[in-house]
């Protein structure tokens, strides 16, 4: 229950990629506004997005403080223009989010192939180490900094003339693969966290092919 013109938020959903984390909910407000609170299981509630008419709230700044913690958020509904008004129980109407553990649940963003270099029959493929919004000592950490060896990359590579995708994997950001001399290859990478059971994989990187600008060929 609540005031007659206030409805509780519903469908609270965490949207998170590389730790950029937004809480979304419904409904679009009619004569009401929202405030969001976030807390760890053992911590105090912190208010964010005060009296907003949006149906999303960026909680990145809070969750990056400790990405291995489990967070809970709640969305309060207030009548527009009368934010002191409360529900019949003497407090504003609110709805809880599902629990969210960033380290286990944030989606892996689409990786990018930074470069590839061929030396004879070997190709070195380097994946860009994407920066996250997680900070340590006033420095933004990369995805590799945060996940360490929990993060692997899968490389798909194939001859331009073929459809079958060979694979390699690395727990760094570099691959060294054998190729056939005189053949052009294409590459795509995917970030994977094997220890997860869901949200294990990123989407694939854009495909890069030999003979394009990113690559370098050196004949030995």
């Amino acid at each position: 229950s609540g005031t007659t013109n206030t409805v509780a938020a519903y469908n609270l959903t965490w949207k998170s990629t590389n730790f950029k984390t937004i809480l979304e909910w419904e409904p679009k407000p009619v004569n009401q506004v929202y405030t969001v609170q976030i807390s760890t299981k053992s911590g105090d509630w912190k208010s964010k997005c005060f009296y907003t008419t949006d149906t999303e709230c960026d909680l990145t700044d809070e969750i990056v403080k400790d990405v291995k913690q489990t967070y809970l958020a709640r969305v309060f509904s207030y009548p527009a223009g009368n934010v002191e008004s409360t529900g019949s129980a003497g407090e504003p109407l609110y709805e809880n989010s599902p629990e969210f553990t960033p380290y286990l649940e944030t989606n892996l963003g689409q990786p990018t192939i930074q470069s590839f270099e061929q030396v004879g029959t070997k190709v070195n493929v380097t994946v860009e180490d994407e920066r996250t919004l997680v900070r340590r000592n006033n420095t933004f950490l990369s995805l590799r900094d945060v996940f360490g060896k929990d993060l692997i990359y899968t490389l798909y590579y194939w001859k331009s003339s073929s459809s079958g995708k060979k694979t390699a994997k690395t727990n760094t950001n570099e691959f060294l693969i054998d190729v056939d001399k005189g053949e052009n290859y294409c590459f795509s990478v995917q970030a994977v966290i094997p220890s997860r059971t869901v949200n294990r994989k990123s989407t694939d990187s854009p495909v890069e092919c030999m003979g394009q600008e990113k690559g370098e060929f050196r004949e030995i």
């Epitope: 692997i152 899968t154 798909y156 459809s163 079958g164 995708k165 060979k166 694979t167 390699a168 994997k169 693969i177 054998d178 995917q190 994977v192 094997p194 997860r196 059971t197 869901v198 949200n199 294990r200 994989k201 989407t203 694939d204």
Partner: antibody, heavy 120, light 107 residues
Framework: EVQLVESGGGLVQPGGSLRLSCAAS????????IHWVRQAPGKGLEWVGY????????FYADSVKGRFTISADTSKNTAYLQVNSLRAEDTAVYYC?????????????WGQGTLVTVSS | DIQMTQSPSSLSASVGDRVTITCRAS??????VAWYQQKPGKAPKLLIY???FLYSGVPSRFSGSRSGTDFTLTISSLQPEDFATYYC?????????FGQGTKVEIK
């Protein structure tokens, strides 16, 4: 509980076709990679091919390339192995297996297998 | 393709024996080797992954090690339920390839 269940095997004449299914439960195949491995009677294990259901990428062993096709239906959480132009040497138990890592071929869960017999 | 040469092809041992099975890769495969156990009429079971890591639920009497391109599966004290066929497998590059198998029989 993670489970893989194969079906669709049977007796088929040389040159014939079959479609083998691998129904997964306890996990979503989109998040993993599914491989097919076969074992001829009394012989060792032979890798057949893989599919990454998140992007449809596949790769096949030379011995089956052009004859076998792996596909996946993520809405049914099922992978398939279409086997065409069958030969006597394709007689084997066919297993599907889940990759523990990405697409490397380290298999933590296997199905019980389905027997394909190619004989006239 | 990378060849995995497994030896011996069979061995006879008694309960309590220490058993060693080896696999040699035809080229460098880093630590990308797994070991499986298979019993008649059953699917293989993962024992060791990444050359030396014991898979969840596998008894600690099983261990794996690497020396260059040589890989070893050791059963420190053979138990009655360990009589089976064991396969090594490289997953360093596509296609993954298996060793020929080692059948461990009761002496």
């Amino acid at each position: 509980e993670v489970q893989l269940v194969e079906s669709g095997g049977g007796l088929v004449q040389p040159g014939g076709s079959l479609r083998l299914s691998c129904a997964a439960s306890g996990f979503t195949i989109f998040d993993y990679t599914i491989h097919w491995v076969r074992q001829a009677p009394g012989k060792g294990l032979e890798w057949v091919g893989y599919i990454d259901p998140s992007n449809g990428y596949t790769f096949y062993a030379d011995s089956v390339k052009g004859r076998f096709t792996i596909s996946a239906d993520t809405s049914k959480n099922t992978a398939y192995l279409q086997v065409n132009s069958l030969r006597a040497e394709d007689t084997a138990v066919y297993y599907c297996a889940r990759d523990i890592q990405s697409v490397s071929g380290e298999f933590d869960y296997w199905g019980q297998g389905t027997l394909v017999t190619v004989s006239s | 393709d990378i060849q995995m040469t497994q030896s011996p092809s069979s061995l006879s041992a008694s309960v309590g024996d220490r058993v060693t099975i080896t696999c040699r890769a035809s080229q460098d495969v880093n630590t990308a080797v797994a070991w499986y156990q298979q019993k008649p009429g059953k699917a293989p079971k993962l024992l060791i992954y990444s050359a030396s890591f014991l898979y969840s639920g596998v008894p600690s009497r099983f261990s794996g090690s690497r020396s260059g391109t040589d890989f070893t599966l050791t059963i420190s004290s053979l138990q009655p339920e360990d009589f089976a066929t064991y396969y090594c497998q490289q997953h360093y590059t596509t296609p993954p390839t298996f060793g020929q198998g080692t059948k461990v029989e009761i002496k």
